[in-house]
Interface confidence: low
């Protein structure tokens, strides 16, 4: 289980039409459910139940987004429509280039993601928890445009890789 270095860039537009970028670095782990690869894309926050909807036409995003899913406590969803791995697969089928799970409320999900599938996803499936998860969700909940960049080595410079 390797460290995933995640950079998140938040875009704040000003009245003049310019925008300011704020870069935050955090770390997670690549799970065995997916590939250990770099990925980049606009963040799309997905509710775990939103991934239950099988009607893809209602929920299509441009190919190449990074899905962020905050998992609920298992008690709040005793009969989930999909396993955590199933949720990751559903996101990838809808065009996600990577999926990041906040497992703070559901640490059991880590074992589920690391059980090792015979057919792992070809895209990264990363999990974050604790302070890193808080940082990520603080940005995601701002409802602003944000991009995530996932790497399997520390970035050299904060903005080196971002494709604006």
């Amino acid at each position: 289980k390797e460290t995933a270095f995640v950079e998140v860039v938040l875009f704040e537009s000003s009245p003049s039409g310019d925008y300011t970028t704020y870069t935050t670095g955090l770390t997670g782990r690549f799970s065995r459910a997916g590939a250990t690869l770099s990925a980049e894309g606009e963040i799309v926050q997905m509710h775990p139940l939103g991934l239950c909807n099988n009607n893809d036409e209602e929920d299509l995003y441009e190919y190449g987004w990074v899905g962020v899913v905050k998992l609920e406590q298992p008690e709040l969803d005793p009969k989930p429509c999909l396993t955590v791995l199933g949720k990751a697969k559903r996101a990838v089928q809808r065009g996600a280039t990577a999926v990041i799970f906040d497992v703070s409320e559901n640490p059991e999900a880590i074992d589920q993601l690391n059980q090792g599938s015979e057919d792992p996803l070809k895209r990264p499936v990363v999990y974050v928890k604790g302070a890193d998860a808080i940082k990520l969700m603080n940005i995601v909940n701002k409802q602003k445009v944000a991009r995530a960049r996932i790497q399997h080595r520390p970035p050299r410079q904060p903005t080196e890789y971002f494709d604006m």
Epitope: A35, L37, S38, E62, Y63, G64, Q93, G95, T97, H152
Partner: antibody
């Protein structure tokens, strides 16, 4: 500068194999899928498969399964595509391409001619 | 399997607008990317996603989507835009790329 440099042109006889190399520079080789795409003379682009340079995992287009093998040597940041049991219709330019959500960087192409 | 269909050829006068379509039944067209290829050269990405231009690609290139058809539009077409254009889409089930048959753009 990010670039992919491919090996030179090859002439092969039917039934032989060819191995094309693609050397990456200017970025972390293991960070992105590498794809192989070919183009027969006067024809369109045809996707052959990809390799994850970090793990070595591969996925081949159904048409080429059993004949194509994609490998990599991370120590020299090079991807390889080997096509076996060559036939005349395999005459084409073979490209490697890095995928960063889309295929953004392409090699210059390697012409493989299959002729008896 | 996904199939992407393009017109084999499109002609346009210099300064006019050229439109090249790419249609596919089983794929959301918003996943389509566009490549330009000139004779003897490797393909070059000109539009990705909805209508994003990589750096170095002129503003006259744009992309749009409607239903299952993606369209590449070149406004104020110039002689140097004469080339073959390919749409490409990621096949989520086959886990690979599919290309359209290509469109030869002729600038009269």
């Amino acid at each position: 500068q990010v670039q992919l440099v491919q090996s030179g042109a090859e002439v092969k006889k039917p039934g032989a194999s060819v191995k094309v190399s693609c050397k990456a520079s200017g970025y972390t080789f293991t960070s992105y899928h590498m794809h192989w795409v070919r183009q027969a003379p006067g024809q369109g682009l045809e996707w052959m498969g990809w390799i994850n340079p970090y793990t070595g995992d591969t996925n081949y287009a159904q048409k080429f399964q059993g004949r194509v093998t994609m490998t990599r040597d991370t120590s020299i940041s090079t991807a390889y595509m080997e096509l076996s049991r060559l036939r005349s219709e395999d005459t084409a330019v073979y490209y490697c391409a890095r995928e960063k959500v889309y295929m953004d960087i392409w090699g210059q192409g390697t012409l493989v001619t299959v002729s008896s | 399997d996904i199939e992407l269909t393009q017109p084999p050829s499109v002609s346009v006068s210099p300064g006019q607008t050229a439109s090249i379509t790419c249609s596919g039944d089983s794929i959301p067209s918003k996943y389509a990317h566009w490549y330009q290829q000139k004779p003897g050269q490797a393909p070059v990405l000109v539009i990705y996603g909805k209508s994003h231009r990589p750096s170095g690609i002129p503003e006259r290139f744009s992309g749009s989507n409607s239903g299952n058809t993606a369209t590449l539009t070149i406004s104020g077409t110039q002689a140097e835009d004469e080339a073959d254009y390919y749409c490409a889409a990621w096949d989520l089930l086959g886990d690979g790329w599919v290309f359209g048959g290509g469109t030869k753009l002729t600038v009269l």
